[in-house]
């Protein structure tokens, strides 16, 4: 066949769906690769063709759209499964073509099984709630387009294995789950199951997400440098190892980039000739406040190094701070005889 623009396997779109549930999958060409939509393509005389390669096979084959009860169908740029089977797993290709134009992309589809508590290999989206912040809601995700607005589905919410009922601060409200006051104890996996009828059959959509309760913006502060501080002096003799930790606390801030860096005499360590290594470690509190520690290390410090200015800097969306470390050269203890002589005023 003639040349076709092949966008390859779009592994960014690793689609995972549950066994025995409906799935609607849009052809990624129109979402990520082409500058026009399906309607434009269709009215220009282009045809959308679907085919697939089964798991652990190399052979591309057409999708069977003549299965009982139209189990697999295509509607515009959407491939429908009503419902999926485990062996639908494979790489799916959508190809847009006419006699003069061709473009195609493949994407992996994985049909997964869940256990009785909704655990599965599915990668879960994470929804962050602010601690003690007032009413916050999560919404049952990715259920648009499965049923018309005239259909009233039933929605059951679970936390882990258990239906959410009589919880003090979590209230199911249809497609939404309301947290009156989010607490650390609300951390966990939440599942909504949407049940709806279609053509005399009942379908279920299961969606699980992870809720993580994080620090509230009400309590957020600029970075706090715990070390270096005014109470600790780094007193070294030439030839010793100099180790200065910079420990900074960052309040949790949604989408904030937390940065810590050292300057030596106003320059980044990379820009100066001395042999400096910097090791960073990061720890998080239960509400995702962050503590970053950067340890500046000079293996064999010189008297020149001990005269330099060592400043720890930190920056977040809340502001920027800096703190200099107190570094000085240790004065060698005078020899005993000299000290005595001086003490007795000898000349």
């Amino acid at each position: 066949s003639e040349r076709c623009d092949d966008w390859g396997l779009d592994t960014m779109r690793q689609i995972q769906v549950f066994e025995d549930e409906p799935a609607r999958i849009k052809c990624p060409l129109f979402e990520h690769f082409l500058k026009f939509n399906y309607s434009t393509a269709h009215s220009a005389g282009l045809t959308l063709i679907w085919y697939w390669t089964r798991q652990d096979r190399d052979l591309e084959e057409p999708i069977n759209f003549r299965l009982p009860e139209n189990r697999i169908s295509k509607e515009k740029d959407v491939l429908w499964f009503r419902p999926t089977l485990l062996n639908d797993t494979g790489n799916y290709t959508c190809m847009l073509r006419n006699t003069t134009y061709c473009s195609k992309v493949a994407f992996p589809l994985e049909v997964v099984q869940k256990d009785s508590c909704f655990n599965s290999p599915m990668k879960l989206p994470v929804h962050k709630l602010y601690i003690e912040y007032g009413i916050q809601r999560i919404t049952c995700p990715n259920v648009d387009g499965y049923f018309p607005s005239s259909v009233k589905p039933t929605i059951t919410w679970y936390m882990g294995c258990y239906k959410i009922q009589n919880f003090n601060n979590v209230i199911p409200e249809g497609m939404n789950l309301s947290f009156l006051i989010a607490l650390i104890s609300n951390n966990g996996n939440y599942t909504c199951v949407v049940t709806y009828p279609e053509n005399g059959r009942t379908f279920h959509l299961t969606r699980t997400l992870t809720v993580k309760v994080v620090g509230s913006p009400k309590n957020a502060v600029p970075p706090v440098i715990h070390s270096p501080n005014d109470h600790v002096v780094y007193e070294k003799e030439p030839g010793e190892e100099l180790l200065i930790p910079c420990t900074v606390y960052f309040s949790f801030l949604m989408d904030s980039r937390n940065e810590v860096w050292w300057t030596i005499d106003g320059k980044k360590p990379d820009d100066i000739t001395i042999d400096v290594t910097i090791n960073e470690s990061i720890s998080h509190s239960r509400t995702e406040d962050e503590t970053r520690t950067q340890i500046l290390s000079i293996k064999k410090v010189t008297s020149e190094d001990l005269k330099r200015s060592y400043v720890c800097h930190a920056r977040s969306a809340k502001g920027e701070v800096a703190k200099a470390a107190k570094v000085k050269q240790k004065v060698p203890a005078p020899r005993y005889t000299v000290e005595l002589a001086c003490g007795f005023g000898a000349t």
Epitope: E19, Q113, C117, T156, Q165, N166
Partner: antibody, heavy 117, light 107 residues
Framework: QVQLVQSGAEVKKPGSSVKVSCKAS????????MNWVRQAPGQGLEWMGR????????HYAQKFQGRVTLTADKSTSTAYMELSSLRSEDTAVYYC??????????WGQGTLVTVSS | DIQMTQSPSSLSASVGDRVTITCQAS??????LNWYQQKPGKAPKLLIH???GLHAGVPSRFSGSGSGTDYTLTISSLEPEDVATYYC?????????FGGGTKVEIK
């Protein structure tokens, strides 16, 4: 379409055991709960327990705990209910009922178990 | 266990009548209530799940309502094929429990 086909009627002696099968088709057997419900002659419905074939998780009604065993064979999409130490009051029609969640969406045709000496 | 009390235990109504069956739980069940229909000599069939959700293929003359401990099944216009026993069932807390049933007959 979903179909649950149960094994045939059984006549059992008191103190013995009975094992009723329920063969499922038309849905993903591993991904739904299989419930067992019984109905004594002229009486109402009584839930006995359920199993999730995907991971073997079971829940039993306290009344039947220790006397009933639910199992599932994923390779044949068949669920089993075994009731031991039978007594005359266990005479009933035993139903399997499939439910993706907790409601029992589809039921088998029922198996009559008669316990008589 | 949660007790489910259904009333009436039986009723007789004419074709076209509006029929109401009630079910009371011994404690709140948060709308986790199903209704089943069982015709003589047959297995039960799910009619309504989660208080008011019509199961696929069930005629729209059947409807459910209620909250807390009190729930209702309504047949808006009784048809001859509706002759059956109707059971409510709670699925709020294990073990699932059924009401005693309501036998519906045609006058």
């Amino acid at each position: 379409q979903v179909q649950l086909v149960q094994s045939g009627a059984e006549v059992k002696k008191p103190g013995s055991s009975v094992k009723v099968s329920c063969k499922a088709s038309g849905y993903a057997f591993s991904s739904s709960w299989m419930n067992w419900v019984r109905q004594a002659p002229g009486q109402g419905l009584e839930w006995m327990g359920r199993i999730y074939p995907g991971d073997g998780n079971t829940h039993y009604a306290q009344k039947f705990q220790g006397r009933v065993t639910l199992t599932a064979d994923k390779s044949t999409s068949t669920a089993y209910m075994e009731l031991s130490s039978l007594r005359s009051e266990d005479t009933a029609v035993y139903y399997c009922g499939e439910g993706y969640l907790d409601p029992m969406d589809y039921w088998g045709q029922g198996t009559l178990v008669t316990v008589s000496s | 266990d949660i007790q489910m009390t259904q009333s009436p235990s039986s009723l007789s109504a004419s074709v076209g009548d509006r029929v109401t069956i009630t079910c009371q739980a011994s404690q709140g069940i948060n709308n986790y209530l199903n209704w089943y229909q069982q015709k003589p000599g047959k297995a039960p069939k799910l009619l309504i799940h989660y208080t008011s959700g019509l199961h696929a293929g069930v005629p729209s003359r059947f409807s459910g309502s209620g909250s807390g401990t009190d729930y209702t099944l309504t047949i808006s216009s009784l048809e001859p094929e509706d002759v059956a026993t109707y059971y409510c069932q709670q699925y709020s807390i294990l073990p699932w429990t059924f009401g005693g049933g309501t036998k519906v007959e045609i006058k």
